[in-house]
């Protein structure tokens, strides 16, 4: 098509850039015409540094065109996101990072892992993208319930731990009181909402020590919480329904092997969790001499018959339940149990099937008298939490 | 026709994140073109800070590049720069500006004032 | 890259004809652009491309240069193109020049 206005004059003959196409292709192009400028899969239109999604000219009455021609330009994903607890790799060459370059995300060995294969590629779209197509970078997960402890020990009836055998056991300090959680996540410590309950509204005052053997020892790792979740079934001074609760820390921790969060009880765990079936718990609440410990201890012990533990708690302490939501562990002979102090500590088992260790209860109540026949210690059963767990993590 | 409108706190203490918002009416930011964040600092020294383009890519000055984010929410027409650990030196009017190296007219929001002070 | 407008100040009279400088640290092509601010505004953009003029604005601008050294010249200057001027260089990331006022003698 040829508009002829004798006035104007043709423009000069658009040359298609290096990695481009021009359309229409016109043998003249005269006033008001234009042109389109496209560019191949993977390079991408540029003006200098600016990008553009497309690019038209039109050709003026002067005989000029209205704007220069574009670049067609190789698309560049650019250095790809650090990943926290891991490292890249630039596959097809050193910072290469142009389209159809391969880098390669892994994860520190040992301690975290991801759940994609780590392979990214840069698309024509301009981001590092996955064979999943996900263009954010993986995420390293710690990695949880690895421990050096085996079953076997014999709190009250307890003995001392060794490093590596508990690396989820979380101090508790408030101004006056001590208790324990146990590290879920790397910024996410479970316990028990009694626990904590009087902190709920002053978090910063709570101080949280981890990767400790030793209760007053000063190599510590401090992390402070953020906030402070208490189950909004717990009512205080009302029994000990619900006693659980979360707090996120203000910062990650780093997973070491003093470090380390305990794994959430999958599904099929309640199987490992019947009675009989043998649980560890640890703290440095008080020991058989009623002073506390000044070393981590813990403590192998049984779960027991929930029927039994609610007949016993029925006759001891009437009007106190032991619900659905609780689970009770200790021997009938007594000796071995959680004390004061314990508090919101972890009732770890472990999964045969991961050889991981996994939380089962959090250290609730019981008798008075930690260890005495008959008189069983209760822990918040942690499986019946998991929607309630997974809920709060997620949304905060 | 196209309009780009800055809001946000006017103090920000230092150390803390500043955060503002550009609105922009009367053309889809993901149709085309980079949407940029550039701020003038008393004495007029104008200073471009990143841009967030048509497709969702970001280009940071490199001056800034460890400290400043910016961001996108489509479905709102909006875009967003966050600046972090900030200091009285990045006390300055924000202006957000639709720049196309000539593809369409440049296009800058009134701007907007921010102190850092404690 | 570093856009260096040597003059801070330029005086000038309404009618004159008048050429504002830019120069670049290193070859940016024709990736520069022209901005005017007047007190209390936003820049207000006035070329493209080192010479491409905005629609709407007067043909009394023109901007020229390539490579490192770009002029932007005002003939026939009037008392409402009293202003600072900056330039833009957007051939690799952005950056602004540091101003140019243009007063009254």
């Known amino acids: 098509h040829h508009h002829h206005h004798h006035a104007s004059r043709p423009c000069p003959d658009p040359t298609a850039p290096p990695n481009g196409s021009i359309s229409p292709v016109q043998a003249i192009y005269v006033l008001k015409d234009r042109f389109s400028v496209f560019c191949k899969t993977g390079f991408e239109l540029l003006q200098g540094s600016v990008p553009l999604k497309s690019f038209t000219a039109v050709c003026q009455k002067d005989g000029s065109w209205d704007r220069p021609m574009p670049e067609c330009s190789i698309i560049d994903c650019g250095p790809p996101d650090d990943l926290p607890n891991g490292h890249v790799d630039y596959i097809t060459g050193p910072e290469v990072t142009t389209y159809k370059a391969v880098i390669q995300y892994s994860c520190e060995e040992t301690f975290y892992t991801m759940s994609s294969n780590g392979k990214y590629v840069c698309e024509a779209d301009g981001f590092w993208t996955s064979s999943k197509g996900e263009k954010l970078p993986p995420v390293c997960e710690p990695v949880c319930g690895l421990s050096t402890h085996t079953i076997g020990g014999r709190i009250v009836g307890g003995q001392p731990a060794k490093p590596g055998d508990f690396p989820w056991q979380v101090l508790l300090l408030g101004q006056t009181t001590a208790a324990a959680g146990a590290l879920i996540h790397d910024n996410w410590v479970l316990t028990a909402a009694h626990a904590v309950y009087e902190k709920r509204m002053a978090a910063s005052s709570l101080n949280i020590r981890m990767g400790i053997l030793k209760r007053l020892s000063p190599h510590y790792t401090q992390a402070w919480p953020e906030e402070i979740f208490i189950h909004e079934g717990y009512t205080h001074g009302a029994g000990f329904d619900n006693d659980i609760a979360l707090i996120k820390l203000k910062n990650k921790v780093t997973i070491n092997g003093s470090i380390m969060p305990v794994c959430l009880p999958r599904k099929e765990a309640a199987s490992l969790m019947r009675t009989d079936f043998t649980g560890t718990v640890a703290g440095w609440g008080l020991t058989q001499k009623g002073l506390l410990a000044r070393n981590l201890m813990f403590v192998d012990i049984p779960i027991a018959d929930h029927q039994k533990c609610t007949a016993v708690y029925e006759k001891l302490y009437p009007g106190v339940r032991v619900s659905a939501n609780m689970l009770c562990a200790g021997l009938e002979t007594g000796g071995k149990d959680s004390c004061r102090g314990d508090a919101g500590g972890a009732l770890v088992f472990l999964d045969n099937e991961t050889q991981r260790w996994f939380v089962g209860g959090i250290v609730s109540w019981g008798s008075i008298n930690c260890g005495a026949a008959d008189q069983y210690g209760v822990y918040t059963k942690v499986i019946n939490y998991i929607p309630w767990i997974e809920n709060i993590i997620s949304n905060f | 026709d196209v309009q780009l409108q800055e809001s946000g706190p006017g103090l920000v203490k230092p150390s803390q994140s500043l955060s503002l918002t550009c609105t922009v009416t009367g053309y889809s930011i993901t149709s085309d073109y980079a949407w940029n964040w550039i701020r003038q600092f008393p004495g007029n020294k104008l200073e471009w800070m990143g841009y967030?383009?048509?497709?969702?890519?970001?280009s940071y000055n490199p001056s800034l590049k460890s400290r400043i984010s910016i961001t996108r929410d489509t479905s709102k027409n909006q875009f967003f720069l966050q600046l972090n650990s900030v200091t009285t030196e990045d006390t300055a009017t924000y202006y957000c500006?639709?720049?196309?190296?000539?593809?369409?007219?440049?296009?800058w929001g009134q701007g907007t004032s921010v102190t850092v002070s404690s | 890259i570093v856009m260096t407008q040597s003059q801070k100040f330029m005086s000038t009279s309404v009618g004159d004809r008048v050429s504002v400088t830019c120069k670049a640290s290193q070859n940016v092509d024709t990736n520069v652009a022209w901005y005017q601010q007047k007190p209390g505004q936003s820049p207000k953009a006035l070329i493209y491309?080192?010479?491409y003029r905005y629609s709407g604005v007067p043909d009394r601008f023109t901007g020229s240069g390539s490579g490192t050294d770009f002029t932007l010249t005002i003939s026939n200057v009037q008392s409402e193109d009293l202003a600072e001027y900056f330039c833009?260089?957007?051939?690799?990331?952005?950056?602004f020049g540091s101003g140019t006022k243009l007063e009254l003698k």
């Open positions: 491309s080192a010479s």
């Open positions: 967030i383009s048509y497709s969702g890519r970001t």
């Open positions: 833009l260089q957007y051939n690799s990331y952005l950056t």
């Open positions: 500006a639709k720049l196309g190296g000539g593809h369409g007219m440049d296009y």
